[in-house]
């Protein structure tokens, strides 16, 4: 099988591969399609040993415009030759293809989190899945940004071992009766554009400024 053919039409799909809650999610958008597909089928093979394209079971005849590939794409060294077919009823509307290399193409979505404000500190609870595959750790670090009155402070909590299970971080030495906003994101070791979570804000209750984070618990 040869994937090097010199005639390339402008692809009719835009793909994005993201690590969402430590799952590999491939999503797509269609460009200039007058007829919207009723369903899609996703197929792939590994470029280093091209075989027949394999249909992704949970993404065959799917109406969704995304596909969870965590259990299919296990290697950060391989390039995955991917074909997306769009159908309307029994008619094939289009087929687009792209090669993905997780080590360089992956973008990292922020984890889910909650915040609870106390008099002079905020508890940030970050939710990670209970088990994360080793190859999906991607040399990531968690960043928690605290914003108040135009000042942004970055916190880089040290997480022992894998990013798995729930993680709580305390932002302390805060000023009572002040509005604080928090954003979290995953930072890659490379200069990659980060995807920050939407801000979550809380107005801290009034209280004694000398009150310690411990006594507020």
């Amino acid at each position: 099988i040869s994937y090097d053919s010199p005639d390339y039409t402008d692809e009719s799909c835009t793909f994005k591969i993201s690590l969402r809650n430590f799952r590999s999610i491939l999503s797509w958008e269609l460009k200039n399609h007058s007829i919207v597909p009723t369903h899609y089928t996703l197929l792939y093979t590994i470029m280093s040993k091209p075989e027949d394209l394999k249909v992704v079971k949970n993404c065959a005849n799917t109406t969704r415009s995304f596909c969870d590939l965590t259990d299919e794409w296990r290697s950060t060294h391989e390039a995955y030759v991917t074909v997306l077919e769009g159908f309307s009823g029994n008619t094939t509307l289009f087929s687009c293809s792209h090669n993905f290399w997780l080590a360089i193409d992956m973008s990292f979505e922020p984890p889910e989190f909650e915040i609870v404000g106390f008099t002079n500190h905020i508890n940030v609870m970050v939710k990670f899945p209970s088990i994360v595959e080793e190859e999906l750790q991607f040399d990531l670090s968690l960043v928690i940004e605290e914003q108040s009155e135009g000042i942004v402070k970055k916190h880089k909590p040290e997480i022992k071992g894998n990013m798995s299970g729930n993680f709580t971080y305390i932002i302390d030495k805060l000023i009572p009766n002040t509005n604080y906003c928090v954003s979290v994101y995953l930072e890659h070791s490379d200069e990659q554009a980060v995807i920050k979570s939407p801000l979550k804000c809380t107005l801290l209750p009034p209280g004694q400024e000398s009150e310690s984070a411990e006594s507020a618990k």
Epitope: H98, S107, E134, Q192, A193
Partner: antibody, heavy 117, light 112 residues
């Protein structure tokens, strides 16, 4: 036949920057990442980094962070590497090489950069 | 970073005779996916590098079967069963298991 055509030799003064290019042809450019490799007499071959030609994501060798900046122009199927604040240690031949995953399969012909006052 | 050490530095061989190049890595190149991303390149005089072997032993298309790659973990070998004139140049091993990718210092194959 897959081709990676690199820009011509550069003779530059110390302290300035230089931007070299690598144009891919006869294959779908955005399906392959592009690597840059330095070859000097002193250090043999050194991997500088890799760029996703589809997303523009980059991965650098720590040693070249701040020295090299990789970019890509999808519309012209061209990858670029800019080398900043050049010194005599940057005199070398620079190669681009495409890869599917960790497999570098085709290399450009190389661009010679000579830094001299 | 992983250090790749190649020996010998220079290899002088008569045409038709065998040749062997050793490559050792400072840590194992076996990845968690079960594959070993050890590769060999040949750079002929005045040319750019060309891929010979990937994944320890897989020959690139067009590479003659007199070339064989072997090894595992940290010790690897490139063998040429019968050297031909077109084989002269510098041979490099390199690893793609761990970032940053790293190269051996090269072995120059000369024809006696």
């Amino acid at each position: 036949q897959v081709q990676l055509q690199q820009s011509g030799p550069e003779l530059v003064r110390p302290g300035v920057s230089v931007k070299i290019s690598c144009k891919g042809s006869s294959y779908k450019f955005t399906d392959y990442a592009m690597h840059w490799v330095k070859q000097s007499h002193a250090k043999s071959l050194e991997w500088i980094g890799v760029i996703s030609t589809y997303y523009g994501n980059v991965k650098y060798n720590q040693k070249f962070k701040g020295k090299a900046t990789m970019t890509v122009d999808k519309s012209s199927s061209t990858a670029y590497m800019e080398l900043a604040r050049l010194t005599s240690e940057d005199s070398a031949v620079y190669y681009c090489a495409r890869s599917s995953g960790s497999y570098l399969d085709y290399w450009g012909q190389g661009t010679s950069v000579t830094v001299s006052s | 970073d992983i250090v790749m050490t190649q020996t010998p530095l220079t290899l002088s061989v008569t045409i038709g005779q065998p040749a062997s190049i050793s490559c050792k890595s400072s840590q194992s190149l076996l990845d968690s996916d079960g594959k070993t991303y050890l590769n060999w390149l040949l750079q002929r005089p005045g040319q750019s590098p060309k891929r010979l072997i990937y994944l320890v032993s897989k020959l690139d298309s067009g590479v003659p079967d007199r070339f064989t790659g072997s090894g595992s973990g940290t010790d690897f070998t490139l063998k040429i069963s019968r050297v031909e004139a077109e084989d002269l140049g510098v041979y490099y091993c390199w690893q793609g298991t761990h970032f940053p990718y790293t190269f051996g210092g090269g072995t120059k194959l000369e024809i006696k």
